[in-house]
């Protein structure tokens, strides 16, 4: 029976060009992790497997780095990269957990500053 | 080109042992979950076991959890199914499959090797 | 353990034909579904991963669908190479359960 929870950073904003880190925790539950996946809607970003570690995948390598933790980080951020990232948290014997983020971008508050305060 | 070939299938009575194994090519062996599934004839698919890439963390049907040991070898690219205590219902086809990176699903599997448990 | 149940357990149709088999989990298995096709004295084949995700080289006829308990695949022109038996698998909890598989035959 499947008893843990999955406890994220739930909604998140960003500045464009900044980083944010993506954290999901695993909770009440006695499970094994064998693996965490990290993905963008159906995308697979990253992979934290418990015997070999991080794999990154290739598309993403520049902009993404492992941790802290099962976290992920992504960096230089895009109004592009908005949008749902899931944990995916692979265990024995319970079996697979997902957790939820929705981050969104959002341009820089110089350029939000510059945007409203324009001479006509 | 991913290949996974089983061997070590046979007849064995009732009580008997017998040792499985996959040779795997084609792909990094080390970096893949492995399983072992089976197919009693004209019956369906069964989970068997589960290895990690590193071999540290071994998974189970209940079943066979006490009498099958699921192992591999990474310097030989191989992947290993002990089996003790066999049962007639152990009678099946045993196939090594490969799971995706992702560990969402089975993407390669081998031919099969047929065990028979019969006195 | 969670129980998959595909239908129809057999099914006869002909070459072009659309076919729909269904598959559904005894509880909430979210997306974590594949489907497998196996033709007699050969090794399953993935088709299907993540309910929807189609795995390199499968033909664009066949697709899947369905998240929570319900699932379908559906094969949109039948071609003489499709008659086989089909599985589900779950990937939610352990053990990974199969559905019984259903049986495509010619008609």
């Known amino acids: 029976m499947m008893t843990g929870t999955i406890e994220t950073t739930g909604n998140i904003s960003a500045e464009k060009g900044g980083s944010i880190i993506l954290q999901c925790h695993l909770s009440s539950t006695t499970a094994q992790v064998t693996q965490v996946n990290w993905e963008q809607q159906d995308q697979l970003l990253a992979i934290c497997n418990a015997d070999l570690g991080w794999h990154i995948s290739p598309s993403f390598k520049d902009r993404v780095a492992p941790g802290p933790g099962l976290g992920l980080t992504l960096q230089s951020l895009t109004v592009n990269d908005t949008g749902e990232y899931f944990c995916i948290y692979h265990t024995y014997p319970d079996g697979t957990y997902t957790g939820r983020i929705f981050l969104e971008v959002l341009e820089s508050s110089v350029a939000e500053h510059g945007a409203r305060f324009q001479i006509p | 080109e991913v290949q996974l070939v089983e061997s070590g299938g046979g007849l064995v009575q009732p009580g008997g042992s017998l040792r499985l194994s996959c040779a795997a090519s084609?792909?990094?062996?080390?970096?893949?979950?492995m399983s072992w599934v089976r197919q009693a004839p004209g019956k369906g698919l069964e989970w068997v076991a589960t290895?990690?890439?590193?071999?540290?963390?071994?998974y189970y049907a209940d079943s066979v959890k006490g009498r099958f040991t699921i192992s591999r070898d990474n310097s030989k690219n191989t992947l290993y199914l002990q089996m003790n205590s066999l049962r007639a219902e152990d009678t099946a086809v045993y196939y090594c499959?490969?799971?995706?990176?992702?560990?969402?699903?089975?993407?390669?599997w081998g031919q099969g090797t047929l065990v028979t448990v019969s006195s | 353990d969670i129980q998959m149940t595909q239908s129809p357990s057999s099914l006869s149709a002909s070459v072009g034909d659309r076919v729909t088999i269904t598959c559904r989990a005894s509880?909430?298995?979210?997306?974590?579904l594949s489907w497998y096709q196996q033709k007699p004295g050969k090794a399953p084949k993935l088709l299907i991963y993540?309910?929807?995700k189609s795995h390199t080289g499968v033909p664009s006829r066949f697709s899947g669908s369905g998240s929570g308990t319900d699932f379908t695949l559906t094969i949109s022109s039948l071609q003489p190479e499709d008659f086989a038996t089909y599985y589900c698998?779950?990937?939610?909890?352990?053990?990974?359960?199969f559905g019984q598989g259903t049986k495509l035959e010619i008609k």
């Open positions: 499959a490969k799971w995706l990176l992702s560990y969402y699903a089975m993407d390669y």
């Open positions: 084609g792909f990094t062996f080390s970096s893949y979950i």
């Open positions: 290895i990690s890439g590193g071999g540290t963390n071994t």
């Open positions: 509880q909430n298995i979210n997306v974590w």
């Open positions: 993540k309910a929807s």
């Open positions: 698998q779950q990937g939610q909890s352990y053990p990974y359960t």
